[in-house]
């Protein structure tokens, strides 16, 4: 069964700046990745970025830089300042759509310690 992992890290240089990394552990080819915060995209979450392998990347504030790391993983840097900036207990979710298997999603938040956290 495919799985999605989510890692949330606060940047040491900018304490209110976050990096979210997500990956897909499965055999299908990824068609679309949606990153949201405040919950899953279909359950009240707000979309931060949508990454398509052919048609490019769309992102919305406070997302600063979304990119593909590999064919099955992505990263997203969030701007740290402003009214819409995330806080330490914000939940981030990643949804990977794979054709024709379907979609898998997982959420994660900043771990209690300052060490990078892994959540599946």
């Amino acid at each position: 069964t495919p799985e999605v992992w989510v890692q949330v890290r606060m940047e040491a240089t900018e304490l209110s700046s976050f990096t979210i990394r997500c990956g897909f552990l499965g055999s299908g080819s990824i068609s679309l990745v949606t990153v949201s915060w405040g919950g899953p995209n279909g359950a009240g979450g707000t979309t931060l970025a949508v990454l398509h392998p052919e048609r490019g990347i769309r992102q919305w504030a406070p997302a600063r830089q979304a990119r593909w790391e590999t064919q099955s993983s992505i990263s997203l840097i969030l701007e740290g300042s402003g009214a819409s900036s995330p806080c330490a207990n914000t939940t981030f979710c990643c949804k990977f759509a794979s054709f024709p298997e379907g979609s898998w999603e997982a959420c994660g938040s900043l771990p209690p310690s300052s060490d990078p956290g892994l959540s599946a």
């Epitope: 299908g28 080819s29 068609s31 679309l32 899953p40 995209n41 279909g42 359950a43 949508v50 398509h52 052919e54 048609r55 949804k95 759509a97 054709f99 024709p100 298997e101 379907g102 979609s103 999603e105």
Partner: antibody, heavy 120, light 107 residues
Framework: EVQLVESGGGLVKPGGSLRLSCAAS????????MSWVRQAPGKGLELVSA????????YYPDTVKGRFTISRDDAENSLYLQMNSLRAEDTAVYYC?????????????WGQGTLVTVSS | EIVMTQSPPTLSLSPGERVTLSCKAS??????VAWYQEKPGQAPRLLIY???HRFTGIPARFSGSGSGTDFTLTISSLQPEDFAVYYC?????????FGQGTKLEIK
């Protein structure tokens, strides 16, 4: 304008074979996942085959697995469905459809359908 | 397999009426739900994708809502051309499945 035009339907005896074709135009065919959906007389819609845009991934329900084969020719902008060992219950209108990644794989374009009748 | 159950199977209504069609999934399908309209002799037509997004050219009287397992398609004021069969569809998990359809007929 997006257009999908099916052909190849007709009357065939049980155990026989047919090859359906779908000619696509008005969009970059190679960038889209494609499917065949059928509707038997008086019944609902059933997805009978799907193929990813790169052609590497395919899907078949148990009802047709081992008998139907989906393929695509991006150079010809065409989708195919090879149907072997046909049964009476395969009688239906067969539609070619296009999936839109950004719409959660919803099928945003359909052909007009081609009728397949399996009868002795 | 995720089963999509539509209700009711048939509805008899008059033009101008408001109608709500129901679709229940046997397990959560996130927001990967679409609605299609089918008329006799015509190909299905996409109305709604991602639960609530109207497809290009679809009139504002059509709206979708729901989350998780319960979804609805609402037509605010039925027009003569709206009498057709409506299908919900999930593309969240393979095998992708359709509901059995709800037929809207003129009273």
């Amino acid at each position: 304008e997006v257009q999908l035009v099916e052909s190849g339907g007709g009357l065939v005896k049980p155990g026989g074979s047919l090859r359906l074709s779908c000619a696509a135009s008005g969009f970059t065919f190679s960038s889209y996942h494609m499917s065949w959906v059928r509707q038997a007389p008086g019944k609902g819609l059933e997805l009978v085959s799907a193929i990813s845009r790169d052609g590497d991934s395919t899907y078949y329900p148990d009802t047709v697995k081992g008998r139907f084969t989906i393929s695509r020719d991006d150079a010809e902008n065409s989708l195919y469905l090879q149907m072997n060992s046909l049964r009476a219950e395969d009688t239906a209108v067969y539609y070619c459809s296009r999936h839109e990644d950004y719409f959660g794989f919803a099928m945003d374009s359909w052909g007009q359908g081609t009728l397949v009748t399996v009868s002795s | 397999e995720i089963v999509m159950t539509q209700s009711p199977p048939t509805l008899s209504l008059s033009p101008g009426e408001r109608v709500t069609l129901s679709c229940k999934a046997s397990q959560s399908v996130s927001n990967d739900v679409a609605w299609y309209q089918e008329k006799p002799g015509q190909a299905p037509r996409l109305l709604i994708y991602y639960v609530s997004h109207r497809f290009t050219g679809i009139p504002a009287r059509f709206s979708g809502s729901g989350s998780g397992t319960d979804f609805t398609l609402t037509i605010s004021s039925l027009q003569p051309e709206d009498f057709a069969v409506y299908y919900c569809h999930q593309a969240y998990r393979s095998p992708w499945t359709f509901g059995q359809g709800t037929k809207l007929e003129i009273k």
